[in-house]
């Protein structure tokens, strides 16, 4: 049965969604304001954002007394969304105050701003490394869901109607579907990854969904009003169930499993794709792009960053 990893503001927790006695285990406690959370399953690493400390942090599972490490501690204000590229070994995040979407290595180095224009309230971010795409929600003045290459290419709005507060976002990697939860319109919808063939999953009976994830045939989401985690069938919306209640303040949620992070080989594995700094996955051939930290230019060879990186 799936393990759910979730941020609870003052801590990050785990709960076995299929357990008989539904009690959560604390992964890391004593936090200020944990908001977004993700993981790298192969290394047992957990990453989270803290919107009060204005930082991205990391620890390891199954390591007694594992230390909390700072990953990014400057230039953040309200990092509301976080996603781990488990294939390219990168972190992607949104910041709704700097109005940026950024990427960096898992240790926070070689940090690059991918998007800084036409963002208002970017929130959730989700990755499909197999196809080189990233997706994010924006619940600002013109609410929408957007898609772009994980290298910052081919940005496109894919959902911009019947949408208001799109808080939660997750990808069904197997069935190639996008799911999102809207806190204002009280629904969970799904669509193809280009935004087409939109369908209702749950409508009208949600209070204030914030984050969304899935495993197998089941969707899981956190709700701010009920302060709990809920589940339902991902196709029909049926089999509704409360997984865990009386939480302090549930925020982001992920299913902690290998199935959510299937491995495959990319050109970035071989000598970092020949890139001196960032090797970012891309939706178009050769399916990767060399990139440089913000403020540093790429040389004409398309692989090496100019001096100063």
């Amino acid at each position: 049965s799936p393990l759910l990893l979730f941020a609870n503001r003052r801590d990050v927790r785990l709960v076995d969604a299929g357990g008989v006695k539904l009690e959560s285990t604390i992964v890391v406690s004593g936090l200020e304001d944990a908001a977004a959370v993700d993981f790298q399953f192969s290394k047992g690493a957990v990453y989270w954002t803290d919107v009060s400390e204005e930082a991205i942090k990391q620890t390891y599972l199954n390591q007694t007394g594992a230390a909390v490490q700072n990953v990014v501690i400057s230039g953040l204000v309200s990092p509301d969304g976080l996603a781990c590229d488990w294939v390219g070994k990168k972190l992607y995040w949104t910041d709704s105050e700097t109005n940026r979407i950024e990427v960096a290595n898992l240790n926070g180095t070689s940090r690059k701003v991918l998007f800084w224009q036409d963002l208002d309230q970017p929130r959730a971010i989700a990755l499909d490394p197999a196809h080189g795409y990233m997706y994010w929600t924006d619940w600002g003045e013109t609410p929408r869901i957007e898609r772009a290459g994980m290298d910052g290419s081919t940005r496109k709005i894919i959902v911009d109607s019947d949408i208001y507060w799109p808080n939660g976002l997750t990808i069904d990697l197997e069935e190639q579907k996008l799911y999102w939860a809207d806190a204002k319109l009280s629904f969970i919808h799904r669509a193809n990854l280009d935004g087409s063939f939109r369908q209702k999953v749950v409508e009208g009976s949600l209070t204030h969904p914030f984050a969304l994830t899935l495993s197998g045939d089941t969707l899981y989401w956190t709700d701010w009003q009920t302060r709990s985690i809920h589940a339902c069938n991902k196709r029909t919306g049926g089999k509704r169930k409360e997984i865990l209640s009386a939480l302090y303040s549930p925020m982001d949620i992920q299913v902690l499993s290998q199935e959510r992070q299937p491995f495959f080989h990319t050109r970035c594995e071989e000598d970092n794709g020949g890139c001196s700094h960032l090797c970012l996955l891309s939706p178009s051939e050769p399916f990767y792009t060399c990139a440089c930290p913000t403020g540093v230019q790429l040389q004409d060879n398309g692989r090496t960053c100019k001096a100063g990186a």
Partner: nanobody
């Protein structure tokens, strides 16, 4: 935790002005997004305006745009709401609210709020 105290309410004639203040205790006030909400008799509490922690962005309800201005002075742990061209329909109890999570405050789910100050617009 932060404690919020509103002041500056009162009786004013239509077309007049008032400045509301929201004073906060707590030295980390600058890490909070702060908003003003109001509740008229017999109505639901509604969003009026908000300002992000850095003061980099402000937000207003359509009904007050161009008339109300929100600002903050983090050195004084205070957020202000300057209300001009007041109308009878602005009559309400005005509440100050704060949350470290901007997304929460702007989606009307805030951690802290004050007791409110009454604004009456009448001739």
């Amino acid at each position: 935790a932060v404690q919020l105290v509103e002041s500056g309410g009162g009786l004013v004639q239509p077309g007049g002005s008032l400045r509301l203040s929201c004073a906060a205790s707590g030295r980390t006030f600058s890490t909070y997004t702060v908003g003003w909400f109001r509740q008229a008799p017999g109505k639901e509490r509604e969003f009026v305006a908000a300002i992000r922690r850095r003061g980099s962005s402000t937000y207003y309800a359509d009904s007050v745009k161009g008339r109300f201005t929100i600002s903050r002075d983090n050195s004084k742990n205070t957020v202000y709401l300057q209300m001009n061209s007041l109308r009878p329909e602005d009559t309400a109890v005005y509440y100050c609210a704060a949350d470290t999570r901007t997304v929460a405050l702007l989606q009307y789910r805030y951690d802290y709020w004050g007791q409110g100050t009454l604004v009456t617009v009448s001739s």
